[in-house]
């Protein structure tokens, strides 16, 4: 089941999946002036069996000089600010990631790929947040979000992370005002079935990972 929305946006933070659950799709998008080749894949799909997962299809871009159907509008400053959490992050592979069953690694970049990636996540996907450069984290809990299915609808849990500017006078984590969870109720206040596949595995995996994976960018 695809998640309805993107993970929540946290001011001054970016999110990253360490691994992608089977069923995840990645748009084949090309940078400005390029388009998908006519017979090329529309998206990549994480597929596999119990022992191995990989991305089906390959994205390929070609010059769109003949017909400008895939132009990519340069975002305005406010749009760039909005999109910062989903711009491409590091393709580095933490070693733990390879051993997580039913998941794919970050796909390598392809030639003339767009500067932003759009993933279509599935229920059970976990993403991790980190403050952008120049901001520091005030944690009240895990800096992660999970796509869950509740009452037949998908939603992302609210990451417990606040990013504050280093120059700002900030409160201690214990003094923060609690943030309302999505849909205005505490996470625990639900009486129906919650899909929790792989949550524990991923949480344990995340605990061992270095945060440096967020800091490298595509060359």
């Amino acid at each position: 089941e695809l998640c309805d929305d993107d993970p929540p946006e946290i001011p001054h933070a970016t999110f990253k999946a360490m691994a992608y659950k089977e069923g995840t799709m990645l748009n084949c998008e090309c940078k400005r002036g390029f388009r998908r080749i006519k017979s090329g894949s529309l998206y990549m799909l994480c597929t596999g069996n119990s022992s191995h997962s990989s991305w089906d299809n390959q994205c390929q871009c070609t010059s769109s000089a003949t017909r400008n159907t895939t132009k990519q509008v340069t975002p305005q400053p406010e749009e760039q600010k909005e999109r910062k959490t989903t711009e491409m992050q590091s393709p580095m592979q933490p070693v733990d990631q390879a051993s997580l069953p039913g998941h794919c690694r970050e796909p390598p970049p392809w030639e003339n790929e767009a500067t932003e990636r759009i993933y279509h996540f599935v229920v059970g996907q976990m993403v991790y947040y980190q403050c952008v450069q120049g901001y520091r984290a005030l944690h009240r809990g895990p800096a992660e979000s999970v796509c869950k299915m509740t009452h037949g609808k998908t939603r992302w849990t609210q990451p417990q992370l606040i990013c504050t500017g280093e120059m700002e006078t900030s409160q201690f984590p214990g003094e923060e005002k609690p943030q309302a969870s999505p849909e205005g109720r505490p996470e625990s206040e639900t009486s129906c079935l919650v899909t929790t596949t792989d949550f524990q595995i991923q949480t344990e995996m995340a605990a061992t990972m270095e945060t440096s994976i967020f800091t490298t960018e595509y060359q």
């Epitope: 993107d6 799709m25 748009n27 388009r35 998206y43 279509h120």
Partner: nanobody, 123 residues
Amino acid sequence: QVQLQESGGGLVQAGDSLRLSCAASGRSFRNYILAWYRQAPGKEREFLAAISWLEGTLYADSVEDRFTISRDNPKNTVHLQMDSLKPEDTAVYYCAADRGPVRPVLAPDVDYWGQGTQVTVSS
């Protein structure tokens, strides 16, 4: 509540152009494609074109050389520029929104539909 509202339909002569618009509201459409379909009397609903947030596009072979889809993300609108119209283009044109990447989604599987706008091309 997601709403898709089409506009721009009407009666035109063969060879003319028409530009349809669709205003989408009620959610973020970043991970949704916006698409156009049409349904002629007595026929099934037919996929025409789709576009992603990053403006990657896909067209049905039947309209690729004459129709152009475009998207205005800040305004949450999608347009369909239809050139060199033919009488066989006469149909009700529907705007659609669907989760996932650009692909020719079968009509029964589409997440959200507009009400449709009539396009009539006379010879």
